[in-house]
Structures are given as C-alpha cells and as structure tokens.
C-alpha cells in the first residue's frame, strides 16, 4: 500500500466538518518525486488539500471538508497517474443525526400469548444504523427502586415493537419499561413507564350471536333484535365493561354506540332499530373498574329486525 | 384481615337438603367471582361451582347440576350454595374460595364437611 | 371439560433434593394453568398462578413453567414444611378442573 488516509471522526454529525489526512510514503516517491495528492469525495474532487513533505520522507495531505452533506460517502485520495488517477487508499464516511428521544411508548398484555408487547415511537430518521432495545425491571414499589433486571428485549430490525414472555413478567406487581436508542453518534432513552402489566391487559372479545327463540318468550318487537353473547372464557372472572356498536346493512350509516352493558349481562334487547332491516353488530369489552385496554371489536353478527316472527341469517367475519 | 368463613355442614340424609354460607371479610367481595371447591375424604379437589361478581353467570359441575344452586349477598358480603336431593357421594369437606382475574383460587375457607348417610 | 392428568401421583424425597410434579393438559390452556399446596386437614394453598407467578408470600423455591399443554412444578431445595400434597388447575375453561393430586413425601 502506497497511501493511508485516517479521519479526524468516520462518523459525524450530518453537515459538520471533517479534516482527514493522507500520507504516502517515501518508498513509493519514485511515481513522482513531488507527487500532487488529489482528493475526491465520491465522484467529486476537492480541493483545498495542504501538502507537505515530512522530516522520514513521507507526504502528507490535510483536508478539512466544512460540511459533510453526505449521509454516506468515499473519501480517496489520489495520484495522478499518466492520463489516469490512482487512488491510494479511501474510507467510508457516514453523517448522521443522534438518536432522538423515542416516545409514545405503550404496552398491552395479551393473556392469550401470555406476553406483554410494547411499541414506541423512534424519532426522526437519524440516517446511521441505529439499534433499540427495550429495558425493564421488576419493582415492589412504584418503580422509584429498581429490583431484578429484565432480560432486555431486542426488536427484529426496522420493527418498533418488543415482547417481553411470560416468564420475564410479574403480574399485579410494577415494573419499569423504557426504550433505549443508541447509534454511533449518541444514545437516548425515552421516558420509563411504570405499569403492572395486568392494568394493560387486552381481552379477547365475546362472541355474538341470536338469542334462540324459547316457545314461551314473547318475539322482539318491531324495530327490536334479541342478541346474546358468549365471554370470553378465559377472560371470563375479569370484571368487564362491553359496548355494541351497530348500523343497517345497506346505506351509509356510521356506527351507532350503546354502552356500557355489563359483560355478565349476557343478552340484550336492542330496539329503536329500523323495522325489516339488515343490522351488523359488533361488541367489544374492557377490565373495569380496574385499568385495561379495549378489546378488539368482535366479528360481526348480521342480524335482520322484523315487524312479526323473527327471522335471521348468522353470518361471521372479522373486521 | 383477609379471610372466608364457611358454616351450615353437618349430617344429611340421602335426599335431604343443606345450605351452606360463606362469610367474608376482609376485601371488597362484590369486585369478585366466588366459589365452592370439595374434597371427598381421602380423595383430591373437585370444583363444584362459581358465581360471578354480581351474580348473573352461575356455571356448576355436571355432577352437581339441577341439584344445587349457587348464589351470593353482596350487601352481606356472603356465599351460599343450596344443596338438594342430596347423594352419599356429595359427602365431603365444601370450601368456599374467592377465585382471582385469572381463574386461582387466591383466598380459601377453612372448609365445612357435609356428610350424607342414612 | 379439560382434564387435568398429574404425574407422579406420589413420590419419596429427602429434604434438600429438587422435586419436579409434571401436570397435563387434555387441550391447550396457554398460561391459564395454577399450582397449590394442601396439608392435612387444612384448605389449600396457592403456590403459582398464570404458570409462573409465584403467589406473595410463597418461598422462591417453588417455582413453575411450561404453556399450552404441558406444566411444571419445581420445588428447587425441598423443605421440612414442603412435604404435603400438590395440586394443579386449570382456569381456562369451565369447568375449573384439578389434577388428581400428587403427595409428596418423607424418604
């Protein structure tokens, strides 16, 4: 190798300076007994290059570039070489931002996959490889004392969201979770939350479906439907708050919201409803009085009202 | 302090009827699902019955369908479970249990047996 | 109903071993699987909950794992007051059914 460039930093701040140097040493004098270094950032050259010849022989050239732009580029420096230029050596410069802050970061706990899944906010694009990781801890208190560390929990790239299994969690007891973003330039870490992760739980919503009609109950009335809903078992001893959500088949009618029922109600009559008409209805649940999340809506049930003998289609579908 | 107090077992005969009550105290009883859990002697636990927070679910044990019925007092804070046509084989130590968000029995009485013999 | 199979159905240790009780379920339970410990003539006990949580006020030896259908319970250094009879159940579905019971006992 005939020359070497070294930089003052590989990676900068995208639009801060960067001075590298180059130096060819005295064995290789004989291309030029002054050879010119020439630099060239990608396909451009520079100029402004500082060439000096050192006290062992050896040449040296100093760039300062005022404003690295690039988020990516080679630095070579070079030697005129006949009609042709010869590079000596070159280096990959990357320019950047630090991480910002990641926000907006919540977590919901699905009992059915027995995790608690959290997903956050990364920030402005920060043009350098940047990694986020997911820290926890398990407190007693209000997580102002820290107790046994989490394994942290690594998202696949490109993905803003992290599960933490079952058996890194503790539930009813608080634990500290917060994102940490870290990338050559810098690290930051968001606000930490301090949740249970029981007070984040996500259900499972009920099933609808038709009341089966019983010889001595009376039919719904006109403009009336007859539904029942079957919990979610294994959500079954959470204490539950449902709203349905209904609107006609045809037209376009937005959702209509009545709530909130019980969930051990278990069956309802809906009336205020269009005679002869094709209704689709969806229901979904909440942990209450204690903190949850809503479920998911249910798949629909598509029901008809009736002005004399109920009749029905079942028809589900997830939306 | 946090506890479950069964009464109302004692010696039925066959065909016979018991109500059984559960006392608590304690916790905020109406936020929670109950239960009944027996223990034939010598043998291992079997659920008998639950009943939700306000009391409109009530799921039994196909052994025990049709003959007892569960039910709650919120305003007393008390559990009972109605045991008719009694059997032989529905003799055993009765627990009344508070059962947790995820179906654990997190709080256990101390148990009151029925016997049934003629 | 969801059957609970329990095994072994009883087993001899010494104080100080690891006792391991493996639990069965017919169909998949997810994590809806819990632990109890009963003495004689006394209610039982919850150990563990949701598979892995140890109940407040229950040693760190006991501790339990497994999802879907298959369940441990792992006693890491068995002590005087351990010996007793342990019991799983599932809260997955209704019924809430038990494992027949496995007795642990003084070698």
């Known amino acids: 190798e005939c020359g070497h460039i070294s930089v003052s930093a590989p990676i900068v701040h995208l639009g801060d300076p960067i001075t590298a140097s180059c130096i060819i040493k005295q064995n290789c004098s004989h291309l030029d007994p002054e050879p010119q270094i020439l630099w060239r950032l990608g396909a451009e050259l520079q100029p402004g290059g500082r060439q000096q010849r050192l006290s062992d022989g050896t040449q040296e050239s100093i760039i300062t570039l005022p404003h690295l732009n690039h988020t990516q580029a080679f630095l070579s420096c070079a030697l005129n070489w006949g009609n042709s230029l010869q590079i000596l050596d070159q280096v990959e410069l990357r320019a950047g931002y630090p991480p910002a802050i990641p926000h907006n970061l919540s977590c919901l706990m699905n009992l059915t996959t027995s995790s608690l899944i959290c997903q956050w906010e990364p920030g402005p694009e920060t043009h350098l490889p940047t990694s986020f990781t997911l820290k926890s801890f398990k407190s007693r208190g209000n997580c102002q004392t820290q107790g046994d560390s989490i394994l942290d929990c690594v998202p696949k790239d490109g993905q803003s969201h992290c599960s933490i299994p079952r058996k890194h969690l503790l539930l009813y007891q608080n634990m500290g979770i917060w994102v940490q973003a870290e990338n050559a330039l810098g690290t930051s870490m968001s606000p930490q939350l301090c949740l249970d992760p029981m007070d984040v739980v996500k259900l499972e919503p009920p099933m609808l479906r038709t009341m089966d009609p019983s010889p001595e109950a009376a039919p719904p009335q006109a403009g009336c439907l007859q539904l029942s809903w079957e919990p979610w078992q294994p959500g079954l001893h959470i204490n539950q708050k449902c709203e349905l959500r209904h609107k006609p088949q045809r037209g376009e009618a937005s959702w209509a919201l009545v709530g909130p029922l019980p969930l051990e109600a278990l069956q309802y009559e809906l009336c205020g409803l269009l005679p002869a008409t094709a209704y689709t209805l969806q229901i979904r649940c909440i942990r209450w009085p204690l903190p949850g999340h809503w479920s998911d809506w249910s798949p629909s049930l598509e029901l008809r009202t009736t002005e004399r003998a109920p009749t029905h289609h079942h028809h589900h579908h997830h939306h | 302090e946090v506890q479950l107090l069964e009464s109302g077992g004692g010696l039925v005969q066959p065909g016979g009827s018991l109500r059984l009550s559960c006392a608590a105290s304690?916790?905020?009883?109406?936020?929670?699902?109950m239960g009944w859990v027996r223990q034939a002697p010598g043998k291992g636990l079997e659920w008998v019955s639950s009943?939700?927070?306000?009391?409109?679910?009530?799921p039994y044990a196909d052994s025990v369908k049709g003959r007892f019925t569960i039910s709650r007092d919120n305003s007393k804070n008390t559990l009972y479970l109605q045991m008719n046509s009694l059997r032989a084989e529905d003799t055993a130590v009765y627990y009344c249990?508070?059962?947790?968000?995820?179906?654990?029995?997190?709080?256990w009485g101390q148990g009151t047996l029925v016997t049934v013999s003629s | 109903d969801i059957q609970m199979t329990q095994s072994p159905s009883s087993l001899s240790a010494s104080v100080g071993d690891r006792v391991t009780i493996t639990c069965r379920a017919s169909?998949?339970?997810?994590?809806?699987l819990n632990w109890y410990q009963q003495k004689p003539g006394k209610a039982p006990k919850l150990l563990i909950y949701?598979?892995?949580n140890l109940q407040n006020g229950v040693p760190s030896r006991f501790s339990g794992s497994g999802s879907g259908t298959d369940f441990t319970l792992t006693i890491s250094s068995l002590q005087p007051e351990d010996f007793a009879t342990y019991y799983c159940?599932?809260?997955?579905?209704?019924?809430?059914?038990f494992g027949g019971g496995t007795k642990v006992e003084i070698k």
């Open positions: 249990a508070k059962l947790g968000e995820l179906g654990m029995y997190d709080l």
């Open positions: 304690g916790f905020t009883f109406s936020l929670y699902w």
């Open positions: 009943i939700s927070s306000s009391g409109g679910v009530t």
């Open positions: 169909q998949g339970i997810s994590s809806y």
């Open positions: 949701y598979a892995s």
């Open positions: 159940q599932q809260s997955w579905a209704y019924g809430l059914s």
